[in-house]
């Protein structure tokens, strides 16, 4: 599907001192979506402001979000889902900035859960797998996912691939023997809806085998 | 009150090209994307691609690649619509037209008719 | 490409009648409640103008004799009591896949 900013990509910063981000949640809680927005300037004193929405919502013209502690948010079966909202940051009734955006446009999955990874030593493969919450959801029911792995000594040196579904193999002969592997993953929108990457999930930590010296393969642990 | 003025009628000979116009007015030209709908002469409509002002960023019909180029002026609130070796079966009227969300279009230009005639 | 088809090609009805135009869709263009399915009128010389969005929302400005309805691959256009200034072709669109498609129109006349 054609789009216009790249998936991940946060609206523009506005030009001025209140510029926000946003992202959007659907049925994040039973048949409730949620909106989150936020200052991008930690600095900002947010002590008087508030947040509006208006536009493409069933039944009311507009909504006030809730403030908890920095960030700002919405619980509520009432968004349209098509049509640009008007999201701005007041002071009592006067408007200091606002943006028009398509609430299907910055959706934020949910992150992935329960991955694991499982040695097949017969097959000298790695199995691994994970669930998400979006396999019984209505909307965003298609992602991808970004699995990354690295040898637990190698600070930054990530591997990622990206997968469809929830199952992803690993050679043996990929990974360095009788080594310990963090693995995590995290997910993106990716039919219709755009957005950005879900938070990662908890890690997941593996050893591979020794290598056996008489058949030069890795023993199991 | 919102708006979409497109330049005038065209004709120009196969093998040109012919650049359309259309400016925006009465709202924040950076809020919506803006796209382009040809009509052939007693035909229906088509969709040829649009563009997002905020960012320059393109989307085209599979159809018009390579034929179209989209392309927007934030200071003057217009967006052009480029199309390159013309020939007889590009005559039509050509509409810009605002998205009001993902992709419906609730403002249309008047129409540009291009007429492509050796 | 979601092929569009529109049915009837054209429509002649009385003055205070009811006019059902539908559209069928080669493959659903609904996402749960979601129906990415929109109606245009044109008349003679003009630019389409949009009357519903999402399937069953009015756009602002339209008399509310117009309606949609429908889910997935089949919906309905319905001009409850047809007036003489609702003479137009009508389209429908789809916005779930690029590209955006568009029915083959449907022709309101007065009988």
């Known amino acids: 599907e054609s789009g216009y900013a790249q998936n991940g990509d946060l609206e523009d910063a506005e030009l001025d001192d209140y510029s926000f981000s946003c992202y959007s949640q659907l049925e994040v809680n039973g048949s409730q979506h949620s909106l989150t927005c936020a200052f991008e300037d930690p600095d900002v004193n947010i002590t008087n402001l508030e947040f509006e929405i208006c536009g493409a919502l069933v039944e009311v013209k507009c909504l006030n979000f809730r403030k908890l502690q920095e960030i700002y948010f919405i619980e509520t079966k009432k968004f349209l889902l098509i049509g640009k909202s008007n999201i701005c940051v007041k002071v009592g009734e006067k408007s200091l900035t606002c943006k028009k955006i398509d609430l299907t446009t910055i959706v934020k999955p949910e992150a992935p859960f329960d991955l694991s990874v499982v040695y097949r030593e017969g097959a000298n493969d790695f199995v691994v797998t994970f669930n998400t919450s979006h396999l019984q959801k209505k909307y965003v029911k298609v992602l991808m996912h970004d699995v990354a792995y690295r040898q637990e000594k190698d600070e930054n040196k990530w591997t990622h691939v990206n997968l469809s579904s929830t199952k992803l193999t690993l050679l043996q002969r990929k990974l360095q023997p009788a080594a310990m592997y963090e693995i995590k993953v995290r997910s993106i929108p990716d039919h219709y809806f755009k957005g950005f990457w879900s938070e990662w999930s908890p890690s997941y930590y593996f050893r591979t085998p020794e290598i056996n010296n008489s058949s030069g393969e890795m023993d199991p642990i | 009150q919102v708006q979409l003025v497109q330049s005038g009628a065209e004709v120009k000979k196969p093998g040109a090209s012919v650049k359309v116009s259309c400016k925006a007015s009465g709202y924040r030209f950076t809020d919506y994307e803006l796209h382009w709908v040809r009509q052939a002469p007693g035909q229906g409509l088509e969709w040829m691609g649009g563009i997002d002002p905020k960012t320059g960023g393109t989307a085209y019909n599979q159809k018009f690649k390579g034929k179209v180029t989209l392309t927007s002026d934030r200071s003057t609130s217009t967006v052009y619509m480029e199309l390159s070796s013309l020939r007889s079966e590009d005559t039509a009227v050509y509409y810009c037209?605002?998205?009001?969300?993902?992709?419906?279009?609730?403002?249309w230009g008047q129409g540009t008719t291009v007429t492509v005639s050796s | 490409d979601i092929v569009m088809t529109q049915s009837p090609d054209s429509l002649a009805v009385s003055l205070g009648e009811r006019a059902t135009i539908n559209c069928r869709t080669s493959e659903s263009v609904s996402i749960h409640l979601l129906h990415l399915m929109h109606w245009y009128q044109q008349k003679p010389g003009q630019p389409p103008k949009l009357l519903i969005y999402g399937a069953s929302n009015l756009e602002s400005g339209v008399p509310d004799r117009f309606s949609g309805s429908g889910s997935g691959t089949d919906f309905t256009l319905t001009i409850s009591s047809l007036q003489a200034e609702d003479v137009a072709v009508y389209y429908c669109?789809?916005?779930?896949?690029?590209?955006?498609?568009f029915g083959g129109g449907t022709k309101v006349e007065i009988k």
């Open positions: 669109q789809q916005s779930i896949k690029d590209p955006y498609t």
């Open positions: 037209a605002r998205s009001g969300g993902r992709w419906y279009f609730d403002v």
